[in-house]
Interface confidence: low
Amino acid sequence: MSLLSVPHTESVSLSTGSTVTIEARPLVCFFNEPHLQVDFHTEMKEDSDIAFHFQVYFGNRVVMNSREYRTWKEEVESKNMPFQDGQEFELRILVLEDKYQVMVNGQAYYNFNHRIPVSSVKMVQVWRDISLTKFNVSN
């Protein structure tokens, strides 16, 4: 299967019911502290506001946040760690009425309440220490 380049940036239009699907694998073993970062941006620029920031510190924790006017807001942290060292995973981010719900390998693990309207999301960027095999947005 061919790999997508990382950082992977894609123009999107999201609404309630949309799903962002990502299939990837950590590039290095957890001992070397790889990260995964997914950012839902409000413009096609990497320094724009972020409606949903999802960062995995593999083997450690997950952090979710938003960034408005270049200011990071209150962080939401989870110690849930369903990701396996060296294993491919499927990440699905569901856009619900009131929140983003993040599923890993078919199970719901994380929730993040909307702070910025979903309709303002223009771009999704997937990056950091992963090999990316799939990125898909379905509405």
């Epitope: 320094d47 200011t71 990071w72 807001k73």
Partner: antibody, heavy 116, light 112 residues
Amino acid sequence: QVQLVESGGGLVQPGGSLRLSCAASGFTFGNYDMSWVRQAPGKGPEWVSDINSGGGSTYYADSVKGRFTISRDNAKNSLLLQMNSLKPEDTAVYYCATGYTGYYYWGQGTQVTVSS
Amino acid sequence: QTVVTQEPSLSVSPGGTVTLTCGLSSGSVTSSNYPAWYQQTPGQAPRALIYSINSRHSGVPDRFSGSISGNKAALTITGAQAEDEADYYCTLYMGTGSNNVVFGGGTHLTVL
């Protein structure tokens, strides 16, 4: 713990140049936007320049635009400020600072004096 | 040129309450300015107290609180202590680009 250590300050004549460095440790440097903030003697702090986490976007105060250049090396956990065409009014303590919610972490500062 | 205004000096008695304000030379401070507050003692770098109007940084005593009151941001110290004597600076976010974060001139607080 988080440490920001500035260096490179000193005495320079008007029109001269200096290159300030900030060595970062104790946090994931590549995740953070970084800033330079200066404070002239007896005055309040003044924002000088910002660079985003990836280094692709930079911002400058009007007072230094075209003379100062901010850059970073995420592999070396290093923030730089190249200062050219220095003026007496650039005399200040220069701090590097960062944080997801404003300037939470500060260095101890490095003194820059522009005088003939 | 945007000017952020603060009272040059204020005083408070130990145990008393004092409010420092942060305004704009033209216009009102709003939530979109994300007011923040910093404390500085002589010879030290500033210390972050409050961000995004009223969020306290970790380790900051709850006697420090932030708000927007009228057309200004405000920092209130309730039950002032001797160690609160310092210079206090506010910052306002003014939009991406030049001078996107502007510091106020500072308020020197004396605890008498």
